[in-house]
Interface confidence: low
């Protein structure tokens, strides 16, 4: 023992002054406490703990649970301890069976014995089943049996304290170890919709579900930017033993505008933290806004195909969509189907699908759709080039040849003279006269095209051509000239 | 013998904050879990929550989860439930209970009761 | 979360009586289910934890029984001091839930 400097305060002393003390059941225990500044006795083992006063301690008839630490504390807070051993072949082990393990920590099989002398103190598994190989323990007769570093394989293990008395084996009652599981990742969360559109007064309801291996996981919901405690419902579920999942809901049971923002949900555990966020927009009313997808003036040739495609936004769904031309509306030859599958979709696609369009078949194709909150609308002028087509060629009285010939987009017509056989007629003659007949007329229908020319300018026989061209295409017309003495005689035309 | 002692009743504000107390004796404190169990006026129990003094492991009813915090003092053998913001639905009896042996692998029961504290919250 | 649902909410009887209370699981749950006994003013008292095993200290009067989802607290001749409300709870799986109570008067 330490020496003590006078005036300095010592520990009592304890009669036996021994640190361990074995006694048989039924025997007497007594143990003196010496000290001017006693203040009591303490006896320990498990979770039982006992105080007395006496600076003797005596048990008349010592029992197996009087096996245990004694201790003596005076006034200065000084303490000495003994260990007393109350030997009872009946009653090898003092247990508590309250066994919880932390995974990675250690954790007491609260099995002390009450003979000391006993050997081979151990665990043993249940109804002779081995322990797992990696389990690796350490024995401590006063305390029980230490488990290092304590796995998740070991929850629900079933286990016995054992030791040999006269060369059997004795079990202690059974133990089953809880594991609490330690957290080796972040929680896994995720949310019903990435994103929500509602109008003023529906309800908002997002779930988050939290996954992690025990319920001791924190999640909350919060509003970006906001301080504001939502309210959240709360359900759970154990999916065996460290599978464990938690669904909150957020509900806003009527929604205002002012709501609108970006919602986390977040989770975290000792290991980290983990978020989610989903996107709320809250509208006055519901919209419609339409995009085409191509020129609303198109041009396409005669006889060829053309579609006409638009993507629309319409919240909320669409109700009523169609295509009209000429005041008539398309039962066919259209489609309109939702851009995604997803069922926060908002934007759709509508097609209408011109085939072999003709010359006639130019104008107005209008596509409207609605809702229950609007109507939008969009127009696509559609322009057919046709090949020029020569209605009329005629010599008037006048004596001017006149051309009038008919195109899209609108023809330009050229005069030609081919003096005698030449069967190319290359010397251009100017009109005289030229005119856009329908200008005033429907805007997409074939434009009509006069153009005349003095016939009393030629001298010789030949022939005349009439040549109306546009972009498409051309087509020429022709007038052949005769003459007898200083008379034309004959002026006949053909194509 | 075994007992949990809690503090006494408490009266406050709505916004206030507050910390009630469960102190074990006559057994290990360390060793055993401590939940707490709510009961409002003329209403049912609620369980809220736990905690293992012996590393502070807790686990909170999602339905509690947030608005309490669940302590313990493991040296001074005490559990503690606390609000930072009392709201005048909190008031309710309060009983912290130790939980004891379950043989069949589970938590146990609550075999041990503190007396119960009464909160009152009111402006 | 477990819901446990008790019937009935209330009875009378009389003293001698035979009282049976049962506790019904939304799933299934083992034994991890106790039996609690609360008296006005006071702290709840265990009765029966592990669905069937009687706390110490508590009279042979009270007995429990079932496993599963279906559970039964029988108290076979009904004495005075009986009367109170009695709570089962479920320690299977967090978060731990208790029944809504059945208060046992006096006919």
């Known amino acids: 023992q330490p020496s003590v400097s006078p005036g300095e305060p010592s520990p009592p002393s304890i009669h036996p002054g021994k640190s361990d003390l074995i006694v048989r059941v039924g025997d007497e225990i007594r143990l003196l406490c010496t000290d001017p500044g006693f203040v009591k006795w303490t006896f320990e083992i498990l979770d039982e703990t006992n105080e007395n006063k006496q600076n003797e301690w005596i048990t008349e008839k010592a029992e197996a649970t009087n096996t245990g630490k004694y201790t003596c504390t005076n006034k200065h807070g000084l303490s000495n301890s003994i260990y007393v051993f109350v030997r009872d072949p009946a009653k090898l082990f003092l247990v508590d069976r309250s066994l919880y393990g932390k995974e990675d920590n250690d954790t007491l099989v609260r099995c002390p014995l009450t003979d000391p002398e006993v050997t081979n103190y151990s665990l043993k598994g249940c109804q002779g089943k081995p322990l797992p190989k990696d389990l690796r323990f350490i024995p401590d007769p006063k305390a029980g049996i230490m488990i290092k570093s304590v796995k998740r394989a070991y929850h629900r293990l079933c286990l016995h304290c054992s030791v040999d008395q006269e060369g059997k084996s004795v079990l202690s009652e059974k133990f089953i170890l809880k594991v609490r599981p330690a957290f080796k990742a972040v929680p896994v969360v995720s949310v019903s919709k990435a994103s929500y559109l509602l109008r003023e007064g529906e309800e908002f309801t997002v779930t988050c579900t939290i996954k992690d291996v025990s319920s001791s996981v924190y999640s909350t919901w919060k509003r970006e930017n906001s301080q504001t405690k939502l309210q959240e419902k709360y359900n759970s579920w154990h999916h065996g033993d460290f599978n464990y999942e938690r669904q909150a809901t957020l509900t806003i049971s009527s929604a205002r505008v002012n709501d609108s923002g970006v919602f986390m949900c977040y989770a975290n555990n000792t290991f980290g933290s983990a978020n989610v966020t989903t996107t709320l927009e809250v509208v006055d009313k519901g919209f419609i806004n339409i995009f085409p997808m191509i020129n609303t003036t198109v041009f396409v040739n005669d006889g060829e195909n053309v579609d006409l495609i638009v993507e629309y936004e319409a919240f909320p769904k669409p109700e009523h969509q169609q295509w009209i031309y000429m005041n008539r509306t398309f039962t066919d030859k259209w489609e309109d189907y939702p851009k995604s599958e997803n069922e926060s979709n908002i934007r759709y696609v509508s097609e209408l699908h011109l085939t072999r369009l003709k010359g006639t078949e130019g104008g107005t194709y209008t596509f409207l759709v609605s809702n229950s909150d609007v109507n939008a609308a969009i127009a696509f002028n559609v322009y057919v080039n046709t090949k020029p087509e020569i209605l009329t060629y005629d010599r008037l009285v006048n004596g001017m040849l006149q051309c009038v010939a008919a195109g899209f987009p609108e023809p330009t017509i050229d005069w030609y003279f081919c003096p005698g056989t030449e069967q190319r007629c290359s010397a251009s003659v100017l009109p005289v006269d030229v005119q856009t007949l329908n200008s005033s007329g429907p805007p997409f229908g074939k434009l009509v095209v006069q153009s005349s020319i003095d016939s009393s300018a030629f001298k010789h026989n030949g022939t005349v051509e009439c040549k109306a061209y546009n972009d498409v295409g051309k087509t020429s017309a022709y007038f052949n000239f005769a003459f007898k003495g200083n008379n034309k005689e004959q002026i006949h035309p053909h194509t | 013998q075994v007992q949990l002692v809690q503090s006494g009743a408490a009266v406050k504000k709505p916004g206030e904050s507050l910390k009630i107390s469960c102190k074990g004796s006559g057994y290990r404190f360390t060793s055993y879990w401590i939940g707490w169990v709510r009961q409002m006026p003329g209403k049912g129990l609620e369980w809220m929550g736990i905690?293992?003094?012996?590393?502070?492991?807790?686990r909170y009813s999602p339905s509690f989860q947030g608005q309490v915090t669940i302590s313990a003092g493991k040296s001074i053998s005490t559990a503690y439930l606390q609000w930072s913001s009392l709201k005048a639905s909190d008031t309710a009896m309060y009983y912290c209970a130790r939980h004891g042996r379950g043989y069949n692998g589970y938590d146990g029961a609550f075999d041990i009761w503190g007396q119960g504290t009464m909160v009152t919250v009111s402006s | 979360a477990i819901q446990l649902t008790q019937s009935p909410s209330s009875l009378s009887a009389s003293v001698g009586d035979r009282v049976t209370i049962t506790c019904r699981a939304s799933?299934?749950?083992?034994?991890?289910l106790a039996w609690y006994q609360q008296k006005p003013g006071k702290a709840p008292k265990l009765l029966i934890y592990d669905a069937s095993s009687l706390e110490s200290g508590v009279p042979s009067r009270f007995s429990g029984s079932g496993s599963g989802t279906d559970f039964t607290l029988t108290i076979s001749s009904l004495q005075p001091e009986d009367f109170a409300t009695y709570y089962c709870?479920?320690?299977?799986?967090?978060?731990?839930?208790f029944g809504g109570g059945t208060k046992v008067e006096i006919k």
């Open positions: 905690i293992y003094p012996g590393d502070s492991d807790t």
């Open positions: 799933q299934g749950i083992s034994s991890a």
């Open positions: 709870q479920q320690f299977n799986s967090y978060p731990l839930t």
